[in-house]
């Protein structure tokens, strides 16, 4: 059962796992949610009736029954982890805590103009978990405007004390705001020789990499595969760090793989969600329950629905035993990973999918692409919306993309002559325009946010956000697309598609069924040669075939140029302008979304 409200002046008795320090009860709840075993917590707020050494303590708790006895205690705030909830969760914490000093290892001290600059510095420093900034009112003259970057083993402060005229806050890496490089390469036959901060068991290098990514101290990892010669080290995932933030060297070893934490690009890749099944593999751990199940998929569902289950092993039924049902072993451990992994015993293992909601919804796998043909099928492009105007009569105006549960990203030029958001309707989950009737549900638009440097499509800044009046409930037919990561500017996208209900040729009409076309990206240099009379800036991106024939056209404007990278779809472009449609040597020009990520985040995350 999902309980989101906090219980004031209430303490949960017993069930303690560990104690951490957090600046607020709200953040204590987030820490509890991300902890592999925590189901409940008790936070102690600052209070004259409470011993100051206990202020800001966040006691993480577990219980077999998923609840604990409640005791009245002033200044105590208790609550439940969001593990029990189905809604999206995020570790992103932008709050600034006034007059609080969050203690940790002060490894970097420098002058900063503001707390915001200090937070940015922390976000762009590979080691930084949180910071404390002495404001210009700070009593000690030599400490004024000093920005202290801090880290700890756990990523949370070792203590929090009251201190006038300072502010503290957390790194915004988990908000996808870091400018650090995102190194996605996995290095085969490679060991990184630096210091190990932890080790866990993992079934493959990808799970090892994801564990590294959400471990606060891990910067890179080495994984020993099941073919590793030393039996005791097989499936071992070594979580590593170094002073420089990079491995000091690489050593060649067969059957080992190494890679990097993806903490600075984690918004657009699944990090917590290990959705694969591992055949002929047994995960060992503390047994929670043994249940009969028809298949390994059914076993995974049972694990996902059991809040304390972290991973499972399914043993298929022997011949016609037990109505063809196998045994589903639901398991857990102290760190969420198997204590040992065994091969060759015939089991099928995997992880709970409960943690998938901690990843951005946009990373969820969608229906496989339908190859060939130009008409889309339902659920193929679940982020695509049709934007209608009701004035003077209702009609399709532009495309758009869902990027958040209240946000649509589209082109600024769509709103020429649109006086008010009241005349706009956003329809999601639509395949055919003919589905839209009088009674078809839609989202009203609360606000149109056009980039303030926009003048006309051809001169750039052709980007706009629509804030919806109500939130979108994500389903298979309507869900967001990931924004590209700023750390991914170097990525070459090779699987890009443009979609829309627009014209199929220059003189045509809006199409009934959502159309799709796979289109290669064109370098800006090449594009500039094709548009001598225009300036193709780095804030634009071009796509098209040299011979023409496939392109976006009138009515597709504002819609997505979607590119698949590392199994995740990214909104690389917004359909903006072009010379004619699908003309030879006239690529389509799109707004280069990666260049506007800061603008998007600034507008969508404004308080």
């Amino acid at each position: 059962e999902c309980v989101t409200q906090l219980l004031k002046d209430t303490c949960f008795e017993g069930g303690d796992i560990t104690t951490v320090f957090t600046p607020s009860a709200k953040y204590c709840q987030v820490v509890c949610t991300y902890h592999p075993r925590c189901l409940l917590f008790t936070f102690t707020a600052e209070s004259p009736s409470e011993d100051p050494t206990r202020w800001f303590t966040c006691v993480l708790k577990d219980s077999v029954t998923e609840t604990l006895p409640r005791v009245n205690r002033t200044a105590a705030i208790s609550g439940y982890s969001f593990k029990q909830c189905s809604h999206q969760i995020s570790a992103c914490n932008k709050d600034i805590y006034v007059d609080l000093d969050m203690k940790g290892i002060n490894y970097n001290s420098s002058v900063a103009k503001s707390a915001q600059e200090c937070q940015e510095r922390c976000t762009d420093d590979v080691h930084c978990h949180f910071f404390t900034y002495a404001t210009r009112q700070f009593p000690s003259l030599e400490h004024r405007n000093i920005c202290l970057l801090k880290h700890t083993q756990t990523g949370t402060p070792t203590r929090i004390t009251k201190l006038d005229k300072v502010v503290s806050g957390f790194s915004l890496k988990s908000c996808a705001l870091s400018n650090l490089a995102c190194i996605r390469d996995i290095f085969p036959n490679t060991v990184f020789a630096d210091s190990n901060i932890d080790s866990v068991m993992a079934p493959d290098a990808f799970v090892c990499g994801r564990i590294c990514t959400h471990h606060p101290g891990c910067l890179f990892f080495t994984f020993f595969s099941q073919e590793w010669p030393k039996e005791s080290q097989r499936n071992l995932c070594l979580l590593k760090t170094s002073e420089s933030g990079l491995p000091s060297t690489r050593i060649k070893k067969s059957k080992a793989l190494s890679g990097f934490s993806l903490q600075s690009c984690r918004h657009s890749i699944p990090v917590f969600c290990h959705s694969s099944f591992y055949h002929d593999t047994d995960f060992l751990g503390e047994e929670l329950d043994i249940v009969a199940a028809k298949s390994h998929e059914a076993c995974q569902k049972l694990c996902t629905n059991a809040v304390r289950c972290q991973f499972f092993t399914y043993t298929p039924a022997q011949a016609s035993c037990n109505e063809g049902k196998g045994k589903c072993y639901l398991k857990l451990s102290s760190n969420g990973s198997p204590t040992k992994i065994l091969h060759g015993r015939g089991g099928i293992s995997g992880y709970t999918l409960r943690l998938c909601k901690m990843d951005n919804e946009c990373t969820t796998k969608i229906k496989p692409r339908i190859v060939g043909g130009t008409a889309s099928v339902r659920g193929e492009w679940p982020w695509q919306v049709t934007l209608h105007t009701t004035s003077p009569t209702q009609r399709h105006l532009c495309g758009g993309s869902i990027i958040g549960n209240q946000w649509i990203l589209t082109a600024a030029h769509c709103f020429y002559g649109v006086e008010s958001p009241k005349i706009l309707r956003v329809y999601s989950g639509i395949l055919n325009q003919s589905e839209i009737k009088e009674d078809t549900s839609f989202f009203g638009v609360q606000e149109i946010i056009i980039h303030d440097q926009y003048k006309m499509a051809e001169s750039g800044y052709d980007i706009a956000l629509l804030k919806l009046e109500t939130t979108v409930n994500y389903t298979d037919s309507q869900r967001p697309i990931c924004l590209p990561s700023k750390g991914d500017r170097n990525v070459i996208y090779t699987d890009c598609w443009v979609t829309g209900w627009g014209y199929r040729k220059l003189r045509d009409k809006i199409q009934n069924t959502l159309q799709k076309a796979k289109i290669p990206l064109v370098t800006n240099e090449e594009c500039q040669k094709r548009y001598r009379g225009h300036k193709i800036t780095h804030k634009m991106i071009c796509a098209g075939y040299r011979e023409g024939g496939k392109d976006a056209c009138k009515g597709d404007s504002g819609g997505p140029l979607s590119c698949k990278h590392n199994e995740v779809w990214h909104l690389v472009g917004i359909t903006s302008w072009g010379e004619g449609c699908a003309q030879r040597e006239r690529p389509g020009v799109y707004t280069n979304v990666v260049e506007y990520v800061d603008w998007i985040l600034e507008k969508t995350q404004a308080v």
């Epitope: 490089a181 995102c182 390469d185 290095f187 990079l246 060297t249 050593i251 060649k252 990097f260 170097n490």
Partner: antibody, heavy 118, light 107 residues
Framework: EVQLLESGGGLVQPGGSLRLSCAAS????????MAWVRQAPGKGLEWVSS????????LYADSVKGRFTISRDNSKNTLYLQMNSLRAEDTAVYYC???????????WGQGTLVTVSS | DIQMTQSPSSVSASVGDRVTITCRAS??????LAWYQQKPGKAPKLLIY???TLQSGVPSRFSGSGSGTDFTLTINSLQPENFATYYC?????????FGQGTRLEIK
């Protein structure tokens, strides 16, 4: 067919700078780790620097650390070596090469000569 | 850092001969060694990796052996096109190091 074509070499004074480029074709450049290897006149081979496919991690020989910067532009299929504070001992033919899973330099360019002399 | 020493620094042989070049690492490098051939004015060419695995397209008269610190490159039945300089390279860890080279010339 894999092709690597270096350019940008030439005569430069000690303390000066030079930027080498290596244009790649015939393979998926963004999938490969790349490197620069040099060879002083009449001498052996010396590894200079490497860069991972994403460009996010670079490695350097001690002899060039702090003076040379390797980079790549995957959209242009091009590898670069920015050489600053050049010394006479940096005089060499500079080769661009692909670094394979075998931990060997699979393919090489034809090289570009850099001469540092006053 | 690992240093590589090749011997001899030069060797004279005739067409049809069998030639052996050795390479020694300053510390154990398992079987992580590569061999290259370089002709005057040309770029090096990878011949062998992992001490004994022939790179595709390389004639079978080239063979490599060894592990730990001592390695050899053997060329059976020398052909005119085999006269060149040969380099070994440790592929155990960064920084990557090459041997100083062995010049194979016609007797």
């Amino acid at each position: 067919e894999v092709q690597l074509l270096e350019s940008g070499g030439g005569l430069v004074q000690p303390g000066g700078s030079l930027r080498l480029s290596c244009a790649a074709s015939g393979f998926t450049f963004s999938d490969y780790e790349m490197a620069w290897v040099r060879q002083a006149p009449g001498k052996g081979l010396e590894w200079v620097s490497s860069i991972v496919p994403s460009g996010g991690w670079t490695l350097y020989a001690d002899s060039v650390k702090g003076r040379f910067t390797i980079s790549r532009d995957n959209s242009k299929n091009t590898l670069y070596l920015q050489m600053n504070s050049l010394r006479a001992e940096d005089t060499a033919v500079y080769y661009c090469a692909t670094w394979g899973d075998s931990w060997g330099f699979d393919f090489w360019g034809q090289g570009t000569l850099v001469t540092v002399s006053s | 850092d690992i240093q590589m020493t090749q011997s001899p620094s030069s060797v004279s042989a005739s067409v049809g001969d069998r030639v052996t070049i050795t390479c020694r690492a300053s510390q154990g490098i398992s079987s992580w060694l590569a061999w290259y051939q370089q002709k005057p004015g040309k770029a090096p060419k990878l011949l062998i990796y992992d001490a004994s695995t022939l790179q595709s397209g390389v004639p079978s008269r080239f063979s490599g052996s060894g592990s730990g610190t001592d390695f050899t490159l053997t060329i059976n039945s020398l052909q005119p096109e085999n006269f060149a300089t040969y380099y070994c390279q440790q592929a155990d860890s960064f920084p990557i190091a090459f041997g100083q080279g062995t010049r194979l010339e016609i007797k």
